[in-house]
């Protein structure tokens, strides 16, 4: 795959992933719950990072925002923070990667600068994707933990103002937003990796370390059928070789020695 194609594809994949992270963050269906077991109406409850909603069988829906910060679980705050950090990093990554795209010419920006920008945007996308994946996973873990805690406390009532508080045993399930978040985070991560791979191809040749091969003919004992003489190159019919043939040679040098790649 060409560098331009790899970079372009990485950018598009990251962009799709980033859009997914925003969508997941805004969605209300992070956790869902059916509350059929009540005498009035079938109720479907779903919760997001920002508000909790109730939809009834009649179609009526009421959503309430989490207006207080102090009363919210620390885990929810952490998930919010992770998703926002992921979005912010994604925005920066997109802006940087637009300027880094090989197919877009901006002034006299050389390939070295574009390579650095591509690497930077790739790293930003990777971190953004990781933030989203961690955020969604923390929320999912919180749901699972709460379910098992509610199972344990199912029969235990807590006194409240002389009354009774009972945990309702209804399973909260993973909402659509969790799956959107996982996929989006994964796409952003993959896109970032592709950008980092593209960066290597963008780096000008003279800035790369040259491949080096050494020639110490006496030491390179290669196995060849035909006994010791044939394998060591010290037979009577072998021409004399220098012990040290000018030290290191780069791949760019003329390939004048047939024994240059005689390694096993």
């Amino acid at each position: 795959m060409s560098v331009t194609a790899c970079q372009g594809l990485g950018f598009v994949v990251s962009l799709i992933g980033f859009a997914g992270i925003i969508a997941a963050t805004c969605m209300d269906q992070w956790s869902t719950q059916d509350l059929y077991n009540n005498p009035v109406t079938a109720v479907f409850n779903y919760q997001g990072l920002w508000r909790s909603c109730v939809r009834e069988s009649s179609g009526f829906t009421e959503c309430r925002g989490y207006f207080t910060l102090l009363g919210l679980p620390a885990m929810l705050q952490a998930v919010r923070a992770l998703m926002i950090v992921g979005i912010v990093l994604g925005v920066i990554g997109i802006l940087v990667s637009i300027f880094a795209l090989k197919c877009i010419r901006i002034g006299s920006m050389d390939d070295s600068a574009k390579a650095k920008m591509t690497l930077t945007s790739g790293i930003l996308f990777i971190i953004s994707g990781i933030c989203a994946i961690i955020g969604v996973s923390v929320f999912a873990n919180m749901l699972v933990t709460n379910f098992w805690m509610s199972t344990a406390n199912m029969y235990s009532g807590m006194g409240g103002m002389g009354g009774m508080v009972q945990t309702v045993q209804t399973r909260y399930t993973f909402g659509a937003a969790l799956f959107v978040g996982w996929v989006a985070g994964g796409l952003t991560l993959i896109g970032g990796v592709m950008m980092c791979i593209a960066c290597r191809g963008l780096t000008p040749d003279d800035s790369n370390f040259k491949a080096v091969s050494y020639h110490a003919s006496g030491q390179n004992v290669a196995y060849r059928p035909g006994g010791f003489k044939a394998s060591t190159g010290f037979g009577s019919n072998t021409r004399n070789k220098k012990i040290y043939d000018g030290g290191a040679r780069t791949e760019d040098d003329e390939q004048s020695h047939p024994t240059k790649y005689d390694y096993v």
Epitope: P39, V40, T41, P73, F139, L143, S150, G160
Partner: nanobody, 120 residues
Framework: QVQLQESGGGLVQPGGSLRLSCAAS????????MGWYRQAPGKQRELVAG???????NYGDSVKGRFTISRDNAKNTVYLQMNSLKPEDTAVYYC??????????????WGQGTLVTVSE
């Protein structure tokens, strides 16, 4: 923690009226259903009336046409207007709410009960 504050119970003559109210407070995200149950001495607890967030109502057979349930979603409060009271309506009336109190946490909360006595 979710608390319920009930009020409005008391002694009333047959044919009279009473208005019960129940306010929920504490850690509340949503209250999908609010309702009233009653328990007369030596009897099972029974549903009087229930109301959903959207206003869907359900009444016990013995109170239909005489009792009216309503709620104020903004105040997390449910009201029970009881008209044409009969001696057989004498019971302890319990407020009952279904509360979404956190992420993945739904509670059924019962009030401490308020006594309604219908007699001459």
């Amino acid at each position: 923690q979710v608390q319920l504050q009930e009020s409005g119970g008391g002694l009333v003559q047959p044919g009279g009226s009473l208005r019960l109210s129940c306010a929920a407070s504490g850690s509340i995200f949503n209250i999908p259903v609010m309702g009233w149950y009653r328990q007369a001495p030596g009897k099972q607890r029974e549903l009087v009336a229930g109301i959903s967030t959207g206003g869907t109502t359900n009444y016990g057979d013995s109170v239909k046409g005489r009792f009216t349930i309503s709620r104020d979603n903004a105040k997390n409060t449910v009201y029970l207007q009881m008209n044409s009271l009969k001696p057989e309506d004498t019971a302890v009336y319990y407020c009952n709410v279904l509360v979404v109190s956190g992420i993945g946490s739904t509670l059924e909360v019962w009030g401490q009960g308020t006594l309604v006595t219908v007699s001459e």
